[in-house]
């Protein structure tokens, strides 16, 4: 039988579950641990102080807890401050906590003291420098000033002037005496140890405002933008460069050591990037506002004024046009221009158009045209309808035929086709 059916092995409300190995296992509720949930969870009471993380474990049938402490705390329940948090150990010494709860510093060589802040004077502890070398204490260490003929950190080696070579920048060392040497420097360097880069710029050939930049046994010329080449003697064709040296449609012309732009109307400046202020020379009349445009200007007129320069009285102010007409002012002479709505004509749009007398009859199917103010009406003949008598009236729509007769629409009338046994206009 499955192990969980045989009376639950789990105590304290633990839930029995069967493992793939067919063994029983208990899923314990909060507060209980152990194989059969038989032990009280020591973490349940929150034994870890602060933000310590509690972990419980069962060892030999006993439930225990351990606390993982946050930075700055220690102890079994994270209640003790960490003395290492304040970094009390100097010079990279390693900090640890002693049995008394205080910090301990493991000092690096050359330092001593509780916090490793005191320098060890190695020159007082014995004689570290050999062959009569002078010991010089340094923070955390010491160095030896060796007498002639000796070298090495402790003056322990007899000196060979070219081993290692004191010559820098690829210079070749040549021993010239027991303790002396000469450096044969590569071109472009000088000095006892070839440590000096010769300044190649005196007498340079940078032309046209080029700046000399010293290199190793050479120099380079930094050219102004108008010149290029090794010595800044080559003209830059600015007109071939991208983006174009002349803006806003200006035409570029290369010159020796520069370029010039011929600007299109409305633009100015060395690269045609300045819009000419046409309002500077504009003559908008008093009260008008000038707006600059490219190669032109626009005068915004105050009420009652019109024209390109707002120099004309606006004839539309007096409402000379008939209602529904649109009034515009002629910008040249200031006169009103009335745009008439349909059905009206004349300078002020106050004359009715007789639609019945101009051209063909607007009414279809011999309808009679009647002129009205601003429009016309059509009086339709029998059988037609619509604004222009364009629609044939369907007399069958009212269903005049009776007794399942078929209705045939005719112009201005209808005909009923009767079923057998019926007669009359409506087959009634």
């Amino acid at each position: 039988a499955p192990p969980c059916l045989d009376g639950s092995p789990c105590a304290n409300g633990g839930r029995c579950t069967q493992l793939p190995s067919r063994e029983a296992a208990c899923l314990c509720p909060p507060g209980w641990v152990g194989e059969r949930c038989q032990l009280e969870d020591p973490c349940h009471s929150g034994p870890c102080a602060g933000r310590g993380v509690c972990q419980s474990s069962v060892v030999a049938g006993t439930a225990r807890f351990s606390c993982r402490c946050p930075r700055g705390f220690r102890g079994p329940d994270c209640s003790l401050p960490d003395p290492c948090l304040s970094s009390p150990c100097a010079h990279g010494a390693r900090c640890s906590v002693g049995p008394d709860g205080r910090f301990l510093c493991s000092c690096p060589p050359g330092y001593q003291g509780r916090s490793c802040r005191s320098d060890v004077d190695e020159c007082r502890v014995g004689e570290p420098c050999r062959h009569g070398g002078t010991c010089l204490n340094t923070p955390g260490s010491f160095r030896c000033q060796c007498p002639a003929g000796y070298t090495g950190p402790l003056c322990e080696n007899p000196a060979v002037p070219c081993a290692p070579s004191p010559c820098r920048n690829g210079g070749t060392c040549r021993q010239s005496g027991d303790l002396t040497y000469d450096c044969a420097c590569l071109p472009g360097f000088e000095g006892q140890n070839c440590e000096v880069n010769v300044d190649d710029c005196p007498g340079h050939r940078c032309l046209n405002g080029g700046t000399c930049v010293d290199g190793v046994n050479t120099y380079n010329c930094q050219c102004p933008p108008e010149w290029t080449g090794q010595f800044c003697t080559e003209d830059v064709d600015e007109c071939q460069l991208q983006p174009n040296a002349c803006h806003n449609g200006g035409t570029c012309f290369n010159t020796l050591g520069g370029h010039s732009c011929v600007c299109v109307n409305g633009w100015t400046g060395e690269s045609c990037s300045q819009n000419i202020d046409d309002c500077a020379t504009a003559v908008c009349f008093h009260g008008a506002t000038c707006h600059d445009r490219v190669a032109s200007f626009y005068c915004a007129c105050p009420m009652g004024k019109t024209g390109l320069l707002c120099h004309l009285d606006d004839a539309c102010v007096s409402n000379p046009c008939h209602e529904d007409a649109i009034c515009d002012t002629n910008p040249v002479n200031g006169r009103a221009i009335c745009t008439c709505p349909p059905g009206f004509t004349g300078g002020a749009c106050d004359q009715d158009v007789d639609e019945c007398s101009i051209g063909a009859n607007p009414c279809e199917h011999l309808g009679r045209c009647v002129n009205t103010q601003g429009s016309f009406l059509c009086q339709c003949g029998r059988g037609y309808t619509g604004p222009r008598c364009e629609t044939d009236v369907n007399e069958c729509l009212s269903g005049p035929c009776r007794n399942q007769a078929t209705c045939l629409d005719r112009i201005g009338q209808f005909t009923c086709i009767c079923m057998a046994g019926f007669t009359g206009t409506y087959c009634e």
Epitope: G229, T233, E234, D237, F253, L256, G257, G258, S260
Partner: antibody
Amino acid sequence: EVQLLESGGGLVQPGGSLRLSCAASGFAFSHYDMSWVRQAPGKGLEWVSYISRGGGSTYYPDSVKGRFTISRDNSKNTLYLQMNSLRAEDTAVYYCGRHATTAYWYFDVWGQGTMVTVSS
Amino acid sequence: DVVMTQTPLSLSVTPGQPASISCRSSQSLVHTYGNTYLHWYLQKPGQSPQLLIYKVSNRFSGVPDRFSGSGSGTDFTLKISRVEAEDVGVYFCSQSTHVPWTFGQGTKVEIK
């Protein structure tokens, strides 16, 4: 016909001044960059000054810098060379030349030249 | 300054025979942007110079096709395939890659 005609040459004492002119005809003078080139008696050619089409850009080799000034009057189709502090080595035939294109700087039209003699 | 050296300095040629003039510059005439600005001029006796070849090998309008130019870098050549009597004069090479623009000392061509 495209033509350049120099004038203004003559005999001048060392330290003196002279102004050469070059009258252009047969082409749109204001559309071309111009230069002066000189040729000492029996010697080669030496470029002495340059001016752009609008006159805004000029250039001189070290041999004449600070002493010669090139200018132009496009309304008169004329190129000028003002020569000050003249020296014996400035003795030469002076030609004005037209630059065919401002990308390659060669001379496609030359004047017939005017002789400048600097002597005491 | 760029020094232009022409060889030979004088040349005596039989009409109908070819002629060749060499021009060497003291530094490369290849402009940073790739073009080579080497030109040839002819100064006929008692006249001003006239353009023959521009940009190494381009014949100027009206120049007979017996004239040709070649070369690159610092070495350039002007060739006349069949010399004619009207070809006498002094031939100058010239560079406009570097300022100041400079000319060769000239090669005098005469007819035998």
